[in-house]
């Protein structure tokens, strides 16, 4: 339901300190200047609501710019604990300590705060994305070595008077950037603690947050063009939806994905795009300024809203989910990637999604609203969309309750 | 300037294995999939897999799917391709190609002699 | 697979003729067509994308038309450097295939 009543203390509608405050591209993510340790050291740190550990770069590596300097800081306190971190691909490895932490375009607050020093890392650093460090503001229980080691945001709420809430924009530039315009360029906003209403238009629409440790949500109905996939909505959901700042694309469950394209491909086939498109191998080009948006279609995902069978949707466009790439050998034309792909562990509303709204991180009320983004890129004919109320019954079924795994639910 | 620089030529023996590289430069590495390919006199080209730099996704032509194996590193922006149980019919070309529309960019050939 | 059909193996021509290269696919690949050059001992160099768009730098003699199963590769005003084997390849489908070939030769 939107979100019209009496604004709580702290949620004034402007915060002008802190919109601007990100930069960066959704293909190497958002990132937002921070300064740890006394005197300040500064730092870009990747903005990731997908993970909970803040984690800088605290070593030479080659992509790295600069990095945090334990030894230069006379408040930094070691905690004599490692943190190992693998992904799927990759994994970064470091130093628990503590130091004192603050962000110049935020709250005009320092914070004691946890911090993971990497001294290895692989595939983790990406060459160019000019960020050194990843802002985890996802909930404890995924924070590594494990739930004990107390995440920024909650350190932040702690120990000063900021709002247990916090929220993003993020702009899409609709073409690529080179390197220089990435560093000129704005990336969006995070305002942390509050809601600034000159970053959408429209109404704010919440849905819950089913469990705090990703930011997990329930996708109750998906839609391309208006057409229901039709699919058990428990798929959706297989085996989680989270969102994701920290990850570009939208990433689907492998039917789901297959199902989508599918229906993609039949709104989209008066040009026949190559196999590898779809897998995200192929750019397609179009001659600069022809690109025919109008051939490809909506997407719309219901999420679950918060009241008893009440749902609202969130609608994206081609111009969201075609990612704009520059290759020299192709610079005549614009080109773009497409950026929904396969997921083996859920649903992963990435920057593809973001990218068309203003999302707001209720954590006081457990809750994410989505309206649409004052910055999202559209064209004269179709707008990014937040709407409802729909009539949705047995939405609670659409979620996956993952098996547990430790020995007391086994069965001997 | 995209530039894909490909390891030096090899003299394997049959049964033996070999790695070829491709070193990847000019361009943001984990943005375009690499391309391996094959040409042997005659035979014209062939594919032989793709690799994703951004998560080590792998794609093969059914036809090589037992005798190649394709790797990254990102932090050196090089892919690697392991070629096993060489035999004669191995003997070819190599070359590393890398996406965007098609195989706008390739690698300056590697080649691979398999002889006792 | 797809195959890609390149009938003649060799065309022989004059510098400053006009000469087409023809390629044929087994099945509708839309305009997922790629061109390449390649001269003797060294790599490909692409040429056509999308069956006739020239990559960036590559001289405006060299054009590309055809949609469906047909396609060609035009050089007018052929100079003696044009001198090489032309290959067509389809990326409509994995896997990517590669026409046999054509030989240029300069009389």
């Known amino acids: 339901e939107t979100d019209e009543e009496p604004e709580e203390p702290g949620r004034r509608g402007s915060f002008v300190e802190m919109v601007d405050n990100l930069r960066g591209k959704s293909g190497q993510g958002y990132y937002v200047e921070m300064t740890v340790g006394s005197p300040p050291q500064t730092l870009n740190i990747l903005v990731d609501t997908g993970s909970s550990n803040f984690a800088v770069g605290a070593a030479p590596h080659p992509f790295l710019h600069r990095y945090y300097q334990r030894q230069l800081s006379s408040t930094y306190r070691d905690l004599r604990k490692g943190v190992y971190v693998p992904y799927t691909q990759g994994k970064w490895e470091g130093e628990l300590g503590t130091d004192l932490v603050s962000i110049p375009h935020g709250p005009n607050v320092t914070v004691r705060a946890n911090i993971a020093a990497i001294t290895e890392s692989d595939k983790f650093f990406i060459n160019g994305s000019n960020w050194e460090g990843i802002l985890g503001l996802a909930y404890a229980e995924i924070a590594r070595p494990d739930d004990s080691l107390e995440p920024f945001f909650d350190s932040l709420v702690k120990q000063t008077h900021v709002p247990n809430l916090f929220s993003l924009q993020l702009c899409g530039a609709g073409f690529p950037l080179n390197q220089s315009e990435v560093l000129a360029s704005v990336g969006g906003s995070m305002i942390i603690g509050g809601i600034d209403h000159s970053l959408y238009t429209g109404s704010l629409w919440y849905t819950p947050i089913r469990r705090e440790w990703y930011y997990e949500v329930i996708i109750v109905r998906v839609e391309i063009n208006g057409q229901d996939l039709k699919m058990d909505c428990k798929e959706y959901n297989y085996d989680k939806s989270i969102v994701d700042s920290g990850t570009t694309n939208l990433r689907l469950p492998k039917k789901v994905f297959e199902a989508a394209v599918k229906s993609i491909k039949a709104a989209s086939s008066t040009e026949k795009f190559p196999d590898g498109f779809w897998l995200g191998e192929q750019l397609v080009c179009w001659q600069a300024g022809t690109t025919p948006w109008n051939i490809f279609p909506v997407i719309s995902l219901y999420l679950m809203g918060e009241v008893t069978n009440q749902s609202f949707r969130i609608t994206i466009l081609p111009q969201q989910y075609l990612r704009p790439v520059e290759d020299v050998a192709t610079s005549q034309d614009d080109c773009y990637k497409f950026a929904i792909s396969q997921s083996s562990t859920g649903t992963v509303m990435g920057a593809v999604i973001m990218e068309g709204f203003y999302v707001v991180f209720d954590r006081a009320r457990k809750r994410i609203g989505f309206a649409v983004s004052a910055c999202h890129v559209h064209d004269e004919f179709r707008t990014a969309a937040v709407e409802g109320p729909f009539v949705t019954l047995d939405m609670e079924d659409c979620g996956y309750n993952i098996p547990q795994t430790d020995e007391s639910t086994l069965m001997t | 300037e995209v530039q894909l620089q490909q390891s030096g030529p090899e003299l394997v023996k049959p049964g033996a294995s070999v790695k070829l590289s491709c070193k990847a430069s000019g361009y943001t590495f984990t943005n375009f999939w690499i391309h391996w390919l094959k040409q042997r006199p005659g035979q014209g080209l062939e594919w032989?897999?793709?690799?994703?730099?951004?998560?080590?996704?792998?794609k093969y032509n059914q036809k090589f799917k037992a005798k190649a194996t394709l790797t990254v590193d990102t932090s050196s922006s090089t892919t690697y391709m392991h070629l096993s149980s060489l035999t004669s019919e191995d003997s070819a070309v190599y070359y590393c190609?890398?996406?965007?529309?098609?195989?706008?960019?390739w690698g300056q050939r590697t080649l691979v002699t398999v002889s006792a | 697979d797809i195959v890609m059909t390149q009938s003649q193996k060799f065309m022989s021509t004059s510098v400053g003729d006009r000469v087409s290269v023809t390629c044929k696919a087994s099945?509708?690949?839309?305009?997922?067509v790629a061109w390449y050059q390649q001269k003797s001992g060294q790599s490909p160099k692409a040429l056509i994308y999308?069956?006739?768009h020239r990559y960036s730098g590559v001289p405006d003699r060299f054009t590309g038309s055809g949609s469906g199963t047909d396609f060609t590769l035009t050089i007018s005003n052929v100079q003696s450097e044009d001198l090489a084997e032309y290959f067509c390849q389809q990326y409509n489908s994995y896997p990517y295939t590669f026409g046999g070939g054509t030989k240029l030769e300069i009389k």
């Open positions: 099945q509708n690949v839309g305009t997922n």
């Open positions: 190609a890398r996406s965007g529309v098609a195989f706008p960019y």
């Open positions: 032989i897999g793709m690799i994703d730099p951004s998560d080590s996704y792998t």
């Open positions: 999308s069956a006739s």
